[in-house]
Structures are given as C-alpha cells and as structure tokens.
C-alpha cells in the first residue's frame, strides 16, 4: 500500500524518493508520474531525469534536492485539492526487471484559516513548504507559525537554513531509498 503524505492547499508538497548512485555522477533515469506506477515508465509524467540532467518537467513540479546525489524527491508548488492522489516515483535501474517503483499518496487538506496578528507576515504564505517528521508512519505536515516582519535577505537565509537542516536530514529518513551497485 502507498505511503501517505499530507499538505495544505497553498503549501508546497514534498514527496520523498531517493537512491544511491553506484558512483558520483553515475545517474539512473527517474520518472515521476501522476497515478500509480504502471508496467513500465510513468504515465502522466510530470518530471523525468536521464543519465545527466532533468530532461522534462512541467510547471509547479521540481526537484529541490541534489538529484546528482540520488535525491529525486518531488516538490509540488502551491498545491490545490486537485493535486491529491497517487504519484509514482520510478527509478529505472538497468537490467531485467530491475526498476524500483514507489507509489506515494498525497492528501491535500483545505488551508486552516487562522487570524494573523497585526504587522506580522505569515511565513508559510511567503515561502510555503512541507516539513515531514522523522519516522516510518505517514508523514505529518508541520506548518510554521507567523514571524515578525523581516527583510527578504533574512527570509531567504531562513528558508535556506530550513531546507538544508530539516529537509536534507529529517526527510531522508522517511523517503524511499535504495542503493545501486
């Protein structure tokens, strides 16, 4: 059965998928599709990589991690209820019947309406992101509370720190990871 991930309308959703390249730069083609993994490849492709680079993508879908190191986790920007459903991450390992297939279920919940105090900006509105907790069960969505007014440089720095610390470390534990070679 599919592992379940959650996000709220307007946030970015994160669907983890990882593999370990046999050698640095020795990449494996990967495709992401909307819908369960079929017999081969991905149907309704939203993004794919080849042995060198991302060679196909559609708007709102991107790889935020370092795919050259095997982090092929999918970020879906500014999700709506229509983004709910099953997504396929397929790691196309060469050989006979070697592909690794992961079906991930994305559940989109309506945004919580919370009154914000005056003179404060909601950080998640400016930089929506889904943070996933460590563990083996369904991932929980954490939303960041409001922060006082800060300038764009500070927001950018904070966003980078969040991405680098929480996403690079915590999310790796809850994603599908395989080693190649």
């Amino acid at each position: 059965s599919e592992v379940e991930y959650r996000a709220e309308v307007g946030q970015n959703a994160y669907l983890p998928c990882f593999y370990t390249p046999a050698a640095p730069g020795n990449l494996v083609p990967v495709c992401w599709g909307k819908g369960a993994c079929p017999v081969f490849e991905c149907g309704n492709v939203v993004l794919r990589t080849d042995e060198r680079d991302v060679n196909y993508w559609t708007s709102r879908y991107w790889l935020n991690g370092d795919f050259r190191k095997g982090d092929v986790s999918l970020t879906i920007e500014n999700v709506t209820l229509a983004d709910s459903g099953i997504y396929c991450c397929r790691i196309q390992i060469p050989g006979i019947m070697n592909d690794e297939k992961f079906n991930l279920k994305l559940v989109i919940k309506p945004a919580k309406v919370t009154p914000a105090p005056t003179r404060q900006r909601d950080f998640t509105a400016a930089f929506p992101r889904m943070l996933t907790t460590r563990g083996h069960g369904p991932a929980e969505t954490q939303t960041l509370g409001s922060l006082p007014d800060i300038n764009l440089t500070q927001i950018s720095t904070l966003a980078n720190e969040l991405r680098d610390s929480r996403l690079a470390n915590d999310l790796r534990d809850s994603g599908a990871t395989i080693r190649i070679g």
Partner: antibody, heavy 123, light 108 residues
Framework: QVQLVQSGAEVKKPGASVKVSCKAS????????MHWVRQAPGQGLEWMGI????????IYAQKFQGRVTMTRDTSTSTVYMELSSLRSEDTAVYYC????????????????WGQGTTVTVSS | EIVLTQSPGTLSLSPGERATLSCRAS???????LAWYQQKPGQAPRLLIY???SRATGIPDRFSGSGSGTDFTLTISRLEPEDFAVYYC?????????FGQGTRLEIK
Amino acid sequence: QVQLVQSGAEVKKPGASVKVSCKASGYTFTSYYMHWVRQAPGQGLEWMGIINPRGDSIIYAQKFQGRVTMTRDTSTSTVYMELSSLRSEDTAVYYCARDFYGSGNYYYGMDVWGQGTTVTVSS
Amino acid sequence: EIVLTQSPGTLSLSPGERATLSCRASQSVSSSYLAWYQQKPGQAPRLLIYGASSRATGIPDRFSGSGSGTDFTLTISRLEPEDFAVYYCQQYGSSPITFGQGTRLEIK
C-alpha cells in the same frame, strides 16, 4: 514510413528453441519500447514482455520468465525474441509491436505492429 | 493479474447501426493505461484508442472510447462495412499487460 519486418515462419520440435527477429525502420529505433505479443490459433492476444531498445530495461511476463530472452542490436535496428523448451501450446503467431510511449508522449499503446511470425511446434 | 472481461462475446449488427462494446476490469485501471485494438482475419491488430478516450492517428471519428475505474466502453457511432472485425481492450496498469478475450463484431 515506419515499419516492423519480422523473420519467416518456423517449424520446431518440442524441447527446441526458436529465435524470431523484428527489424525496425522509419524512426529512431532507440526512442521506443518494443513488445512481443503472441496469438494462438483462434485465440486472443497474450503479452510476453517488453524491451527498451537502448538495452537498459527488459520486463518479462511471469508466465514466460526463464524461457524467454529478448535482446536487441542497435547497429541493425533489430530486436529478437528467443523462446526455449518449446511445447505444442507455443504454436502461435508471434508479433513484435512498438509502443508509442516516449518522444514527449506519455500515453501507452502499441501503434506499429510487425506482420507476425508463425511458429509451429510439432513432433 | 488484471483480468479484462469483454462483452458481448459476439455482436451482430448492420452497417449504419451503432455498436457499443464493453470492457470490465477485475480491479481499477487508470484511464491513462487503457487501449483498444481492432483485428481483422490474417492481419496484425491496429491501435484505435489510447488513454481510454484518445483516438490514435488516422482513426475515424466514428470511433470513441470512454470510461474509468473498472468499466470502459468502445463506441462505433455508425458502422461501416470495414468495421466488422474483432476488438480487444488492453491494460498497462500492472504486470503482466493483459488483453480482453475480444468481442467479435459481425454483420447481421
């Protein structure tokens, strides 16, 4: 024009092997997957497996695993299907069929078929 | 394995009539992964419909496909003499790829 030309009819004895070829022309050979499908006399269609002509991915139907081998030769744009340990139930017409998945199209369908190769297994 | 059951087994109609062919899957199939083929005696199959409802190149618009989940339909709005053949549905959703047993469309 796009076409798939298969090798000629074969008559084999039970226990033998048969190797059927399928030569592609009129398109970029390595851009499209190739299926093998068979049809016993008066029966329906049965999928045997699929090969990515880049050579990096092959999937066999479980029913044929261990008996079927699919290979390709990019220099001649040809795919091959070898079936071993033949029995009378393997008497059928064997088709290669290109899947039009790829080249920016991410739907599935066997859009070009070979003319078929009749394999008769008889003692 | 996903079993596709086609009905009716044989359909007898006259040219000009409307034909409705059914394909039922033993478990849900994404519409993206369903196709229909036509086969005439002594010939290879021909792709008619992919993605449950998209016509393949060169297929006349009297052929249409619909459905989702476990129930799919191929409709031929006005039968032409060349449409009498065997029709197969096929799924790509899970291995092995499977075909229905076929519906024979014959002239009444």
